[in-house]
Structures are given as C-alpha cells and as structure tokens.
C-alpha cells in the first residue's frame, strides 16, 4: 500500500515535467530506495543541479527565455568546482551565455536567479569586464588563460548553458 501510494505520487510528479521533458534520467540518492534524483535526458548532473548546453545561437534575452521555457535559467556559477564541471562539456571554439548581466551598464552585475553577485567568486578573463556597452557575460576559452568569463553585447547571438534544480521523486 505504501509503495503503491509512493508510486502514484512519483507518477503525478513526472506528469508535471512531461510537457517539457518527456524523458528523465534518475539515480538513487544514498541508500534509500525511495529517494531518486532526476535530470531531463540528455541534461548532465552535478551536485543538486542539471545542466543543458544549448547549441542554437541566440541573443542573451532569447537564451534566457529558452531556458525558462524548460523550467531552467541561464547558468549561475557559484563555485570553481561547478565551473570545472561545466567546462568539460563545452567546445573550445565556442562562447556560451551565462545568467549574468549588467543591464544598466553601471557594472552592477546580477545573476538571473537573484543570487548575490560575489566579486570573490568570479572567473573573469584578465582585463574583463572592459566595456560598459557589453552588458552580458559569456564563458569562453583563451589559450593563455583557459576558460573564463568575458562581457559581450547582449544582442549578439551565442550558444548558452541552462541550469535547473534536480527533480526529486
């Protein structure tokens, strides 16, 4: 009976996500058979989040809207470990929008999910950000410094990275 009601709950939760994510990849969390964490297929997972690399070239605002439709946001990077995970799935000759912007052009950078911008946990390339008109952030590869952030024009189409919380069922 208990297992039946748990299964019903899981099915109803899965139905919520089915519209945007017809397939989920789930793993058992810990030793308890009842706790599963899922990411949409073919998203990748790291800690409590799921990540999707969007290879379509779009402006920053359209990229954020695209993530939003999937129940996600453009990626907010909180730690060096998180960035190190993300870059494993990126192509060196491409640039990818982050969920970081400065719409007022006053160097008040803000994350899309309202996470406070912490100057101590940023990974700007040297000399960046360097242009008040460049109000959106990308992550890209420079041979001298490897992967880091750069400010660019928001309207310039780029690839992007979406991030969402894992789905627990």
């Amino acid at each position: 009976n208990f297992m039946y009601s748990k299964t019903v709950k899981r099915l109803s939760k899965l139905r919520e996500y089915q519209q945007y994510h017809p397939s989920l990849t789930c793993v058992m969390e810990g030793k308890d058979i009842e706790d599963w964490s899922c990411c949409p297929t073919p998203w990748t997972s790291f800690q409590s989040s799921c990540y999707f690399i969007s290879t379509g070239m779009q402006s920053w605002t359209k990229s954020q809207k695209n993530c939003s439709v999937m129940g996600a946001d453009l990626v907010v990077i909180n730690t060096r470990e998180e960035q190190d995970f993300i870059i494993q799935n990126l192509k060196r000759n491409s640039s990818y929008f982050l969920g970081l912007s400065d719409p007022g052009g006053r160097r008040h950078w803000q994350w899309v999910d309202q996470t406070p911008y912490n100057e101590n946990v940023t990974f700007w390339h040297s000399g960046e950000p360097n242009n008040l008109d460049e109000r959106c952030a990308i992550i890209n590869f420079r041979s001298s410094e490897e992967w880091g952030w750069n400010d660019i024009h928001c309207h310039v189409p780029q690839k992007s990275i979406c991030k969402m919380k894992k789905i627990y069922i």
């Epitope: 779009q58 402006s59 920053w60 605002t61 359209k62 954020q64 809207k65 912007s101 719409p103 007022g104 052009g105 360097n130 242009n131 008040l132 008109d133 460049e134 109000r135 959106c136 660019i152 024009h153 928001c154 309207h155 310039v156 189409p157």
Partner: antibody, heavy 121, light 111 residues
Framework: EVQLVESGGGLVKPGGSLRLSCAAS????????MSWVRQAPGKGLEWVST????????YYPDSVKGRFTISRDNAKNSLYLQMNSLRAEDTAVYYC??????????????WGQGTTVTVSS | DIVLTQSPASLAVSPGQRATITCRAS??????????MHWYQQKPGQPPKLLIY???NLESGVPARFSGSGSGTDFTLTINPVEAEDTANYYC?????????FGGGTKVEIK
C-alpha cells in the same frame, strides 16, 4: 554638438567597389558602437553593418555578408564601409549612425546626412 | 530575424487631430519590463531622427505631443495634436537581438 558626415558615394558599375567614410565629431568616438544603415530610393530603412566601440565585434546581414566590410579608426574619429562586388540592389543613400546602448539593446541616437551610392552600368 | 509590421502604410490627419501608428513584432521585443522598440521620424530629404526610445521614452528635444506605448509584440506611436510640420515617414526599430530590424514605415500627411 554631435556631427556625423558621410563621404565617398558615387556612381559605380556592377561588380565595382567603393569605400564610404564617416567623420565623427562632438563626442568621444571610441566609446560608441557605430552602424551603417541604407535606404533604397523610395524605400524604407535597412541596417547594413555594425562595429562595436572596441572594434571586437562586427556584424552584417546576409545580403551584404562577404561583400561589405565595416571598420573604424578611433585615432581619426572615422568609420568606414568597404563595399565590393556591388550590385544594382545596393543602390541607396547610406547613413552612418551612432548607437546608444539601453538595457539589453540599443538605438540610433544620431545620424549623418547620408551619401548616395548608385550602382548602374 | 524579427519582422516588424507597421500600420497603416499611410494616413492623412487634420491639424489638431490625433495620429496613431502601430508596429507589430513577429516575436516579443520585451524582457523583464524593458521594451526594446524605438521610433524615428524622417522628413523628405533628411536623415531619420530619433523620437522615442525603449517604447515610451521621449528623446531630448522632441515635442511632448509625441508619445509611445506598448509591450511584447504590439507598440504604438501617437502624435497628439498633429501639427503641419509632422508631415514625414515614421519607422519603428527593434534592438533586442541582431540583426536590428526596421518596420516598413508609415507616411503621415497633414490635410
């Protein structure tokens, strides 16, 4: 006073080349993105190319990509448009315009008087 | 590319009356309360002149009889009251993504 003065237009045969110039004054040229916008006779406005303030970014519509090249010389306060392989449909008045950024986009806050390019055999 | 459709293509208005021009975008040009639609006036033989930026902000030096409104995909430029000197073509332009695109224009004539 902000001023943008275009030059270099003229009559050219199909397949020919022209180089347009835009002399800027009255503002810190190196701090602004710049664009070329054209207007065919009796028609509407068509954006032709953009260059960022730091010269790091240029962009073109498919109609001119590979044929037109935008460039700038911040030391000379000048914007250029090199036009090669010209076609009859490139006939237009070409305006130089200054971009002013606003939030996630921009608008054109100052325009030159334009220079006329005629492509005809 | 985002397509901007202006209507009407032309209109004739008596001095003192209201003129209303609409611009419809093929997709939203708004994001988090910012509307990246702009309006320009072009008189015969002259370059375009900025009137309104970001849907509703009046450019410095532009008479207060010009106003703009709208969000998402639908935007309006209003001239009220129209004066004889307002005879011109009016264009909308979006800048939320490249390439920047212009509407086809609306010709306003004063009766």
């Amino acid at each position: 006073e902000v001023q943008l003065v275009e030059s270099g237009g003229g009559l050219v045969k199909p397949g020919g080349s022209l180089r347009l110039s835009c002399a800027a004054s009255g503002f810190t040229f190196s701090s602004y993105g710049m664009s070329w916008v054209r207007q065919a006779p009796g028609k509407g406005l068509e954006w032709v190319s953009t260059i960022s303030s730091g010269d790091s970014y240029t962009y073109y519509p498919d109609s001119v990509k590979g044929r037109f090249t935008i460039s700038r010389d911040n030391a000379k306060n000048s914007l250029y448009l090199q036009m090669n392989s010209l076609r009859a449909e490139d006939t237009a008045v070409y305006y130089c315009a200054r971009q002013l950024y606003y939030s996630y986009g921009y608008y054109f806050d100052y325009w030159g008087q334009g220079t006329t390019v005629t492509v005809s055999s | 590319d985002i397509v901007l459709t202006q209507s009407p293509a032309s209109l004739a208005v008596s001095p003192g009356q209201r003129a209303t021009i609409t611009c419809r975008a093929s997709e939203s040009v708004s994001f988090h309360g910012t509307h990246l639609m702009h309006w320009y006036q072009q008189k015969p033989g002259q370059p375009p002149k900025l009137l309104i930026y970001a849907a509703s902000n009046l450019e410095s030096g532009v008479p207060a009889r010009f106003s703009g409104s709208g969000s998402g995909t639908d935007f309006t430029l209003t001239i009220n009251p129209v004066e004889a000197e307002d005879t011109a073509n009016y264009y909308c332009q979006q800048s939320i993504e490249d390439p920047p695109t212009f509407g086809g224009g609306t010709k306003v004539e004063i009766k």
